[in-house]
């Protein structure tokens, strides 16, 4: 119904009042509900109402505005501190324990972050971004910089419908439509071999608990299980050679561990060589990444940290140990 | 298949001590932390001890610390638990059990040995 | 350190029973618990991990519940090979503390 310039939507009436023409909505159940769009912000709840907009947000703490957009710092908030004598004893151990497992510790010290203390070091949003990994959009925490809010924002929960076909068909130069898709993975970039690469700038630099050989093996896995962690692709870098740059890795050499080995190993000397994992060099390849998302890393430095940040979940699904993002040609170091 | 071996126990006296393996197969030792747990004699489990092979980082129970030194030779696939200054009430089967989280102390233990007897009496 | 309080200590059942027992750690432990089950001379299985987490290869008769401090493990219907004894695991922080453990027996 209308009246004067006034159009009104389906199901509602329209009434003259001391302000002017109004449309309303006798039964909210006949009208288009203003919570179909989901205005409200933040986690914040959606009640339906009879006039426009047609719905009233009810915001979560510490969010408020009609959409719940707007953030209110609580007043003084102290920053937190480690107070636990325990987790200053169990810092930088290489073990991570859960008791310490949080920002006011650095994450045991970088025991739970693959040695990386504050993932979100360059996040400069008003909001912990590290408590908003909840399973629910924060638009506050959508930026690179606070790693994409854990790609919270565009529906992480899809799954590989094909997965287990998929992982098995992953990177294997043979395109398979079914999985070429953000959440297969691309299909490990075998249907774009005649795109050009799109490389983030810099390399992921990973020590991961398994001897070369066995990662050398496991690597289409083990890519795409990194790239689906960080919604791209990755490649292992080759060296001037064109060697893939995966090196046998030797251990800590850090003082502390070596006292803590010659304490554990009958003959230390003997078996200071012994292979304790790999360091692996990564690229970013964002070639499908771009044409199906605004989220894709341009350089390393977050990817690293997001990594990071999946270990602080305990979501890895490999012995990763550190994770570092080199921005210049590495060295072939141990 | 992933196992656990425990060796080594036995009758020993009061103030005596005495050393238990754990060999492990089927998984990368490395990656993942081992712990030893006891149990008395008709009694309930008591965590012991904590070792992540990689880092070699420990951590016990105030019950045998100062006592008792777990290890872990990499090269061998096997932890190794040192009791020294035994007591009466240390006897019990001890198990060793892996972790099902690679670098954390703060997972479950997925896989455990059949346990040896540690008997410590006069 | 953290103290792991189960009841009942021990329970009777009989086959086909609905069976529950509790777990209440002293403080907040979040999701960090474990379910073992021990039978008669051997060594303890995990059964559930995570709070509420099958372990692989663990029957779906076998659930668990809570987080904070309260915790559950039910048995919706108990089979001959479950009379064991039951233990609950905090591994939130060190050192690691388990429940004095529900015996199971038959009615």
């Known amino acids: 119904s209308s009246c004067g310039q006034v159009k009104c939507r389906k199901g509602e009436q329209c009434v003259h009042t001391a302000s002017g023409p109004r449309c309303f909505c006798p039964s909210p159940r006949d009208c288009e509900s203003g919570c179909a769009s989901s205005p409200c912000q933040h986690g914040g709840s959606c009640h339906p109402q009879r006039q426009p907009p047609y719905y009233s947000c009810q915001c979560a703490p510490p969010f408020s505005g009609s959409r719940c957009e707007l953030y209110t710092a609580p007043p003084s908030t102290p920053p937190a501190t480690c107070l636990s004598q325990y987790c200053a004893d169990k810092a930088r151990d290489g073990v991570c324990d859960e008791a310490c497992n949080s920002h006011a510790c650095q994450w045991d010290g970088g025991d739970c972050s693959l040695t990386m203390e504050n993932p979100w070091a360059n996040c400069s949003s008003p909001l912990p971004c590290w408590d908003y990994i909840n399973n629910q959009c924060d638009e506050l925490c959508n930026t690179v910089e606070c790693l994409f809010d854990n790609f919270e924002c565009q529906g992480n929960s899809k799954t590989c419908k094909y997965d287990k076909y998929c992982a098995d068909h992953f990177k294997d130069n043979h395109c398979d439509q079914g999985c070429n898709s953000e959440e297969c993975g691309w299909d490990g970039l075998d249907c774009a071999a005649d795109q050009p690469e799109n490389l983030a700038e810099g390399t992921l630099v990973i020590v991961v608990l398994m001897p070369p050989e066995q990662l050398l093996q496991d690597a289409r896995s083990f890519l795409r299980a990194l790239g689906t962690l960080l919604h791209t692709n990755l490649r292992i870098k080759r060296d001037s050679q064109g060697e893939l740059m995966v090196y046998p890795y030797y251990g800590e050499k850090s003082a502390a561990m070596k006292k803590q080995r010659m304490t554990r190993r009958s003959l230390p000397g003997e078996q200071e060589q012994e292979v304790a994992g790999s360091k692996v060099f990564l690229e970013i390849d964002n070639r499908q990444c771009v044409q199906d998302s605004d989220h894709c890393f341009k350089n390393t430095d977050a990817a690293a940290a997001l990594l990071a940040s999946h270990a602080i979940q305990g979501t890895l699904s490999y012995p990763l140990v550190s994770v570092v993002s080199e921005s210049l040609t590495p060295e072939r170091t141990q | 298949e992933v196992q656990l071996v425990e060796s080594g126990g036995g009758l020993v006296q009061p103030g005596g001590s005495l050393r238990l393996s754990c060999a492990a197969s089927?998984?990368?030792?490395?990656?993942?932390?081992m712990s030893w747990v006891r149990q008395a004699p008709g009694k309930g489990l008591e965590w012991v001890s904590y070792?992540?092979?990689?880092?070699?980082?420990?951590y016990y129970a105030d019950s045998v610390k100062g006592r008792f030194t777990i290890s872990a030779d990499t090269s061998k696939n096997t932890a190794y638990l040192q009791m020294n200054s035994l007591r009466a009430e240390d006897t019990a089967v001890y198990y060793c059990?892996?972790?099902?989280?690679?670098?954390?102390?703060?997972?479950?233990?997925?896989?455990w040995g059949q346990g040896t007897l540690v008997t410590v009496s006069a | 350190d953290i103290q792991m309080t189960q009841s009942p200590s021990s329970l009777s059942a009989s086959v086909g029973d609905r069976v529950t027992i509790t777990c209440r750690a002293s403080?907040?432990?979040?999701?960090?618990l474990a379910w073992y089950q021990q039978k008669p001379g051997k060594a303890p299985k995990l059964l559930i991990y995570?709070?509420?987490s099958r372990a692989s290869g663990v029957p779906s008769r076998f659930s668990g519940s809570g987080s904070g401090t309260d915790f559950t493990l039910t048995i919706s219907s108990l089979q001959p090979e479950d009379f064991a004894t039951y233990y609950c695991?905090?591994?939130?922080?060190?050192?690691?503390?388990f429940g004095q453990g529900t015996k199971v027996e038959i009615k």
């Open positions: 059990a892996r972790h099902s989280g690679y670098y954390r102390i703060s997972s479950a233990m997925d896989v």
């Open positions: 089927g998984y990368s030792f490395t990656s993942y932390g």
């Open positions: 070792i992540y092979p990689y880092s070699g980082a420990t």
């Open positions: 403080q907040s432990i979040s999701s960090y």
């Open positions: 995570g709070a509420s």
């Open positions: 695991q905090q591994y939130y922080s060190s050192p690691l503390t």
